[in-house]
């Protein structure tokens, strides 16, 4: 059963590749299947074919197996490219070399060890004899190849096509022979597949017998082709996972080639005075861990037993006692001559990429691995490992592990924003890192919204001014207060949270800042029934460039018929030209004897390409702003409706789809406003509500 | 690219007026909070003032309260700075900086222009 | 109102030393805190923004730490092109400040 469920590990597999027989001659079986695996075993076993199975075709998009008596050297029979395809060839039939006694071997080697020519094993010319092909089935007694189908001593041999030479093995090097490695073959791409003590390796895309973090398309450096030896992690040697349930992973066998040498690509940059990256390349002399404490020699065991010895560690350069980074460490590292202290980082070695002006990410920085660990507010960032419960509380699929490492910011939420890293802090569990996109990467982050024009956008400022006093239900409409005074409208999008603009905020004391909900009047003047007045207990700010802040309410605010919150539209959507909306607030009105009443102005939405025609093209709008114009001529926010919403309705359903903020000018006519679009912002928004803790009411 | 660029700087008797101009471009000076910082020759920097996006009232310093106006025309992407009875102590080199982050700090300076107070 | 007080006022160091400067505010002003480097003739630079985050484009050797009212500037080894005034400022309120911005230090060379 077991070795059934296993046989892919037999396999080479070439991915999107599949094999087209030139000859007419040569035969195909094909069956619909669900797997690859099961496309294996059957090839392994050679059941229900006509053939012997040297390879097959696993077709992903018709789930459908192609079985071949060929393979990829096979004459008559060529390569071809094709996405849907993967390729799987039986690693028998394609070595060159034995494993132990040379048993499998099922390659082209035809000439024995003094250089006679093999007979052929149908033959019993010159010598009789009962190894027939139809008495060992399925030990590919073909032509006149070398094979081993006793699993004698000596290896594979063949009968002679001397008379007077009866049978001789023939010289084919073993795998561990053939096979061999520099340093501590973290570069080596051989063709191992088996450990020091014979077990078969378990494929790196499989996750049985053993679950691991190592899958090839996380890993697309590391060589985790099919189930052959890698050294991913820095041990002293290559190793792999093996098919036996009670053995996870073993070293393999591997010699170190005559040639010592290795490639470019192999050496991380050597540096002799600072750190370039992790410090994996520092060949300098600093002997002193961070604090003064000496470092124990490499080649000693004394205070400290270990196995990070220059022999297990070769081209690490392991000399004296000098701060070295073999392991793939955060940065260089010893162990101390303190019996106490066992390990410390040499910190003090200052780092070559001396600025940060480079740190920058591609798209939203889901590939980002830089190794900042900071975030914009300046708090260190927490380690992964220990935030992982948090993570799988907001995300819905496994996070790529081997990104996640040491506290690093990363994006393994694909969050649209940029990197960012948990911190440790209670009232800030996680924030942004101050890491820019890299310039003139123009890849959206976000891919349907209507013409998005990656650019450098500009915001029209404006007012509601000329709007008609407003009583329907706008219970989710706040007045933020500064000192006492209206300062900027917002929006209660939760009991606890306020959606409202950066600008906002004039003073870093929260205690300067009230929420007025529920009130008609700026100055509360017959509100007083409903009128709720909450203290700000916390300001977060939106992402870099957003003009955003989610404003935390001290308590939550208390929903009744005056008082309620507004709906969020869908991450990255759109809503079609020419829709109703309205801006509310209760700024300047250009009115002199203002009232003090919440005002609306009713508006249309605008395609941001028209938007930026009537803005006679001096401003181009991108992914993150949404455009709407007046149906009056001098109609639309104004100073103090900053932070308010732009409130829009779709399918019976009022949703806050922008957020009024500063931009140039007031009310113009022919003029669009230009908000901020809360669409681009609302996953971010979300994760705000999901993480950040509120007080209960 | 992003920048500022002062003008309006030169000679003034004491007890005179000098309006000083901040031009931006590569941003709208009306989405941010834009503030003026002076050093006198020789001396540190000395925040002036700053001016918010919304209808609150620009903040001074001491010494230029009631004295010095920020204001700002969106229009022209330019901020102001008027400065009355000017006194000898007010020579020095005027910046104009847009403040960044979450308001919190200057992220993007002008090269600044000389104001002399003599007579 | 919040007061910012610098010290040194002048310092001088040998090229390679760990040089520390530091800034208190009258009150407490959290993490608001920017640091910045003005050269002789030139426009001051933004080195360090909310106490310890590194501008862009500024070497490592730069950090800052602090919150509340005690803040520190670190140059971890002094290099030749350090040699500048160093201003911490203030950034948690702006209304009935004198001025947002320290007295400032003078970094030389020995």
């Known amino acids: 059963q077991r070795k059934r469920r296993n046989t892919i590990h037999e396999f080479k597999k070439s991915a999107k590749t599949t094999l087209i027989k030139i000859d007419p001659a040569l035969k195909i079986k094909t069956k619909k299947v669900n797997t690859a695996d099961q496309c294996a075993n059957r090839c392994t076993r050679n059941k229900g074919l006509p053939f012997t199975c040297k390879a097959f075709v696993f077709d992903k998009a018709r789930k459908q197996c192609l079985w071949f008596p060929f393979n990829s050297m096979s004459s008559g029979v060529k390569k071809e490219f094709g996405h849907e395809f993967d390729l799987y060839e039986n690693k028998d039939y394609i070595r060159n070399c034995i494993i132990g006694k040379g048993r499998s071997y099922k390659g082209t080697v035809s000439i024995t060890k003094s250089g006679i020519k093999c007979q052929p094993w149908s033959s019993m010319i010159p010598h009789e004899h009962s190894f027939l092909p139809s008495s060992y089935r399925g030990k590919d007694l073909q032509e006149n190849y070398c094979r081993n189908p006793r699993g004698e001593e000596g290896g594979p041999w063949c009968f002679t096509s001397n008379p007077e030479v009866r049978y001789e093995v023939c010289d084919i090097p073993q795998c561990s022979e053939v096979e061999c490695m520099t340093c501590n073959g973290e570069s080596y791409r051989g063709l191992m597949d088996h450990t020091e003590s014979g077990k078969i390796c378990q494929r790196w895309d499989h996750q049985t017998p053993h679950r691991h973090k190592f899958l090839p398309e996380r890993y697309p450096d590391k060589g985790f082709d099919d189930n052959y030896c890698r050294n991913p992690d820095g041990q002293p040697r290559p190793w792999c996972y093996t098919l036996d349930p009670h053995t996870r992973w073993e070293y393999c066998a591997i010699k170190t080639c005559a040639d010592n040498t290795m490639n470019d690509t192999d050496v991380p940059l050597e540096t002799t005075e600072c750190i370039q990256g992790q410090g994996e390349g520092y060949r300098g002399t600093v002997n002193t861990i961070w604090n003064g404490i000496p470092c124990q020699r490499w080649d000693s065991q004394y205070p400290h037993e270990h196995d990070m010895t220059p022999e297990n560690f070769k081209c690490k350069d392991l000399r004296e006692n000098y701060c070295r980074n073999p392991d793939g460490s955060e940065s260089p590292w010893c162990f101390t001559t303190d019996p106490n202290i066992r390990v410390g980082y040499c910190s003090q070695i200052p780092n070559c990429d001396m600025s940060h002006g480079q740190d920058c990410y591609r798209g939203n920085g889901k590939n980002y691995m830089g190794n900042l660990s900071q975030t914009r507010s300046g708090l260190t960032c927490s380690m992964w490992d220990k935030n992982m419960e948090d993570l799988h509380r907001h995300i819905f699929w496994e996070p790529d592990a081997s990104k996640l490492n040491e506290n690093y910011c990363r994006n393994p939420d694909d969050d649209a924003h940029g990197p960012w890293c948990y911190t440790g802090n209670p009232l800030i569990p996680w924030d942004y890192c101050p890491i820019s996109r890299c310039e003139g990467d123009t890849t959206p982050t976000i891919v349907n919204l209507d013409h998005p024009v990656i650019s450098c956008a500009k915001t029209k400022q404006l007012r509601v001014v000329n709007g008609i006093p407003t009583r329907t239900n706008i219970g989710w409409m706040v007045s933020l207060r500064y000192r006492n005074k209206h300062i900027c409208g917002g929006s209660l999008i939760k009991e606890s949270w306020v959606l409202t603009a950066r600008q906002c905020f004039p003073s870093r004391d929260l205690k300067d800042y009230e929420a007025w909900l529920g009130i008609h009047d700026v100055h509360g003047r017959g509100d007083e029934k409903c009128k709720q007045v909450l203290n700000v207990s916390q300001l977060v700010y939106g992402p870099e460039g957003s003009d955003l802040v989610l404003m935390k309410l001290a308590r939550p605010a208390v929903l009744d018929d005056f008082v309620s919150t507004i709906d969020l539209p869908n991450y990255g959507c759109t809503i079609p030209e020419k829709t109703s909306c309205s801006v509310y607030g209760w700024g300047y009105t250009g009115l002199i004897n203002y009232d003090g009443l919440l005002r609306v102005a009713h508006l249309y939405i605008m395609g941001n390409e028209k938007c930026s025609q009537h803005h006679r093209g001096k401003v181009t709008l991108n992914e993150s702003e949404i455009c709407a114009g007046a149906e009056k001529i001098g109609s639309g926010p104004c100073e103090g409706d900053y932070g308010g919403p732009l409130v829009c309705e779709q399918h019976k359903m009022r949703m806050v789809l922008g957020v009024i903020v500063p931009g140039r000018g007031c009310a113009i006519p022919n003029r669009p406003g230009i908000f901020v679009r809360v669409a681009y912002y609302a996953k971010w928004i979300h994760k705000i509500i999901l993480t950040y803790k509120v007080p209960q009411s | 690219e992003v920048q500022l660029v002062e003008s309006g700087g030169g000679l003034v008797q004491p007890g005179g007026s000098l309006r000083l101009s901040c031009a931006a471009s590569g941003f709208t000076v009306g989405r941010y909070y834009m503030s003026w910082v002076r050093q006198a020759p020789g001396k540190g920097l000395e925040w002036i003032g700053i001016i918010y996006t919304h209808g609150v009232n620009p903040d001074y310093a001491s010494s230029a309260k009631g004295r010095f106006t920020i204001s700002r025309d969106n229009s022209k992407n330019t901020l102001y700075l008027q400065m009355n009875s000017l006194r000898a102590e007010d020579t020095a080199v005027y910046y104009c900086a847009r403040v960044g982050g979450f308001n919190d700090y200057s992220d993007i300076w002008g090269q600044g222009t000389l104001v002399t107070v003599s007579s | 109102d919040i007061q910012m007080t610098q010290s040194p006022s002048s310092l001088s160091a040998s090229v390679g030393d760990r040089v520390t400067i530091t800034c208190q505010a009258s009150e407490s002003i959290s993490t608001y805190l920017a640091w910045y480097q003005q050269k002789p003739g030139k426009v001051p630079k933004l080195l360090i923004y909310r106490a310890s985050t590194l501008a862009s484009g500024v070497p490592s050797r730069f950090s800052g730490s602090g919150s509340g009212t005690d803040f520190t500037l670190t140059i971890s080894s002094l290099q030749p092109e350090d040699v500048a005034t160093y201003y911490c400022?203030?950034?948690?309120?702006?209304?009935?400040?004198?001025?947002?911005f320290g007295g400032g230090t003078k970094v030389e060379i020995k």
């Open positions: 400022q203030q950034g948690y309120s702006y209304s009935n400040v004198d001025n947002a």
